[in-house]
């Protein structure tokens, strides 16, 4: 398992919410991506391929998420100061084999300008 800071912009703010971008290698076909806040699992998304290359997407801990061919985005809404924390993208790779796990993350700073529903 390799742990490190994300070397890309992991947090994208909009409309009082944040998009947390979890990238994965383009060669990866089957995986589980978990979003961790500190040590707690907030969200997860699992992509598997069945016979005939049918793709299955499952979530045990559901968040609004978006899948592309090299990233999973998790969306958190109604930001407040309690959201400030370390967030980690925990990637488990099933395909190509063998199994690999890699963890990347960063600190989410919350500033007044990013909070939801603030009075102008």
């Amino acid at each position: 398992e390799i742990n490190g800071s994300a070397n890309y912009e992991m947090f994208i703010f909009h409309n009082g919410g944040v998009q947390i971008l979890c990238k994965y290698p383009d060669i990866v076909q089957q995986f589980k991506m978990q979003l961790l806040k500190g040590g707690q699992i907030l969200c997860d998304l699992t992509k598997t391929k069945g016979s005939g290359n049918t793709v299955s997407i499952k979530s045990l801990k559901f968040c609004h998420s978006q899948l592309s061919n090299n990233s999973v985005s998790f969306f958190l809404y109604n930001l407040d100061h309690s959201h400030a924390n370390y967030y980690f993208c925990n990637l488990s790779i099933f395909d190509p084999p063998p199994f690999k796990v890699t963890l990347t993350g960063g600190y989410l700073h919350i500033y007044e300008s990013q909070l939801c529903c603030q009075l102008k």
């Epitope: 390799i2 490190g4 070397n7 290698p25 060669i27 084999p97 063998p98 890699t102």
Partner: antibody, heavy 125, light 110 residues
């Protein structure tokens, strides 16, 4: 010096069993995925089995259910338990190190970079 | 399952000449990072030459070069030395199986 040394090959009858061993030295064995690759006399290379750093195992269709790959990290050793052997299993068997790394959204393949000298398995009646 | 086909089966050249070995995949390889080349001399284990389609492994002379993407990959030896006559294999990292080898190209002295 980084080295892989195979042992355990020999002559065995069809249906028999054999256990190959591979002793690793000069590198952190538990940090690498390992393979067995075989080569029948005068023929090409054939992938046999893979064991990951987490202990997960994968096999070629031709050996599935008959051959078992395992590792003992404390002894820096790789094994191949061979059961229900067939004449078609006759080959030189190589122990091979797989150098790859995953870091965030990068997946690096550095090739099968260390090979043992091979051990010969002959299945014949 | 991707099949790798190497050509020619045998290549007869003289020292000092340029050798071009081909490896063709039965379907497009998603990334060239997964292709490698090996050299094998009689009664020896294979030796890694090139990984990532074009990166020379440690200690490999610069007369060896690799190129290609998609379905077509090439190993070039710019000026053959006597010790270069051997069998060459291309290899792919993949899913099922995790490792695939080409059938090999024998490079022999003309």
């Amino acid at each position: 010096e980084v080295q892989l040394v195979e042992s355990g090959g020999g002559l065995v009858q069809p249906g028999g069993s054999l256990r190959l061993s591979c002793a690793a030295s000069g590198f952190t064995f538990n940090g690498y995925d390992m393979h067995w690759v075989r080569q029948p006399t005068g023929k090409g290379l054939e992938w046999v089995a893979l064991i990951g750093t987490a202990g997960d195992t994968y096999y070629s269709d031709s050996v599935k259910g008959r051959l078992t790959i395992s590792r003992e990290n404390a002894k820096k050793s790789l094994y191949l338990q061979m059961n229900s052997l067939r004449v078609g299993d006759t080959a030189v068997y190589y122990c091979v190190r797989d150098r790859r790394a995953v870091a965030g959204h990068y997946y690096y393949f550095y090739g099968l970079d260390v090979w043992g000298q091979g051990t010969t398995v002959t299945v014949s009646s | 399952e991707i099949v790798l086909t190497q050509s020619p089966g045998t290549l007869s050249l003289s020292p000092g000449e340029r050798a071009t070995l081909s490896c063709r995949a039965s379907q497009s390889v998603s990334t060239s990072r997964t292709l490698a080349w090996y050299q094998q001399k009689p009664d020896q284990a294979p030796r890694l030459l090139i990984y990532g389609a074009s990166t020379r492994a440690t200690g490999i002379p610069d007369r060896f070069s690799g190129s290609g993407s998609g379905t077509d990959f090439t190993l070039t030896i710019s000026r053959l030395e006597p010790e270069d006559f051997a069998v060459y294999y291309c290899q792919l990292f993949g899913s099922s199986p995790p490792i695939t080898f080409g059938q090999g190209t024998r490079l022999e002295i003309k």
